[in-house]
């Protein structure tokens, strides 16, 4: 928890942020909450970014005040006006860019006082993997595909039956650059798989960790995917 100390007779108010990650090309949320205040007209929300001269966003007297907004954020930011009433100053950032990564400050003024908190925002690409049986291969083979990752992730296979086994010798992973020349498609193939076993394809970089599971039996195939953002901590 970071508390901004008030000056000139105003009290400090508690402002809380959560470190988060943005998926490039998609919309992201920079989370910030503060002590709600009944006098809505006095609430000022300012978002600033370290190393950027202009403001990221300003919300003042009930509306966006974007005259001081930095060019790099023009037309890409919004606060949730109805959520401001309950102390939510989170910022929606449209079309996240790699260059949006950095340290942001959420600065709040209310009739009760002032406060601020910093937030580390990481950017990259992450997507859910899908694991399928590769019927074109000569032996029983699994193919794990995830369309967008950046930076380049690691891929590790695991199995429920052979826990702790190292599958690096019987797997092959490739990274194919996507058309925008930043993100990459991840393809990993696992050979010599056995029936009645659950296999997991785990893809991880410093932003996210994703897992694709497949259970192959003689009668059916069951799949499950899970994606988790890393380093989402409050301050």
């Amino acid at each position: 928890l970071i508390i901004g100390f008030g000056i000139s007779g105003r009290h400090s108010i508690t402002v809380t942020t959560v470190a988060s990650a943005g998926n490039i090309g998609e919309d992201g949320i920079l989370s910030c909450t503060f002590e709600p205040d009944i006098k809505l007209s006095d609430i000022v929300i300012q978002w600033l970014k370290e190393g950027v001269l202009g403001l990221v966003h300003e919300f003042k007297e009930g509306k966006d005040e974007l005259s001081e907004q930095d060019e790099m954020f023009r037309g890409r930011t919004a606060v949730f006006a109805d959520q401001v009433i309950v102390g939510n100053a989170s910022l929606r950032l449209k079309n996240v860019q790699l260059t949006d990564a950095g340290t942001y400050k959420c600065y709040i003024i209310t009739s009760k006082g002032k406060g601020n908190a910093n937030l580390e925002y990481k950017t990259g690409a992450f997507s859910m993997p899908e694991v399928n049986v590769d019927y074109n291969a000569s032996s029983e083979t699994l193919r794990c595909e995830a369309p967008r990752w950046f930076p380049q992730p690691t891929v590790v296979w695991a199995s429920q039956v052979d826990q702790g086994a190292n599958f690096s010798e019987v797997s092959n992973t490739s990274f194919e650059l996507n058309s925008e020349n930043v993100t990459m498609k991840v393809v990993s193939v696992l050979y010599n798989v056995t029936i009645n076993n659950t296999y997991s394809c785990m893809i991880e970089n410093d932003i996210a960790k994703a897992t694709g599971d497949i259970k192959v039996t003689e009668s059916e195939i069951k799949r499950r995917s899970h994606l988790q953002l890393l380093n989402s901590k409050a301050s």
């Epitope: 709600p36 009944i38 809505l40 006095d42 007297e61 006006a81 109805d82 309950v86």
Partner: antibody, heavy 116, light 107 residues
Amino acid sequence: QVQLVQSGAEVKKPGSSMRVSCKASEDTFSSYAISWVRQAPGQGLEWMGGTAPIFGTTNYAQKFQGRVTITADKSTSTAYMELSSLRSEDTAVYYCARGGPYFDYWGQGTLVTVSS
Amino acid sequence: EIVMTQSPASLSVSPGERATLSCRASQSVSSNLAWYQQKPGQAPRLLIYGASTRATGIPARVSGGGSGTEFTLTISSLQSEDFAVYCCQQYKNWPFTFGPGTKLEIK
């Protein structure tokens, strides 16, 4: 002195609509949200929804969604709450209040009786 | 929605004594909690907001405490005008929700 002045008591038939007004001072209207809270006889308080003219936003409790409409007339600093398809369970005292998030000033309340 | 519960439903205390009322939220509401007093035939009156900040004109013998899911309202040295219904309200999330109230009666 902050004052919220509500319209008078009403008796309504089931299936009809009701409309309660709440006149506030100009600074209340331009700086605060106005919420509507009801209280059925012998029961607790129930938040129905609210409007923040300064933000241009209105929120409703899920229970009343589709049946309640809250509006604000900035020119007269008056908020209105309309509830349709009335039933006997809607018999209550309806309050307007300054806020959310919490409510520091309240209207005197308007008793609405729904009876055939 | 966040469900607010209060205990006890009613409380009998002698004038001059202390009364402690409890309010519980079904999930954390941080310190986003208010307390109101209501007398028969009257509109509610704000006592406490932010779990512990007294509203304008509220005497120091009224105090609020707690955070997260457990909250208390304490009235020390009860006076005749304190006997009323007290209810809590969370404003962490929409919709705002109230507790059912605690009736404070003269013993």
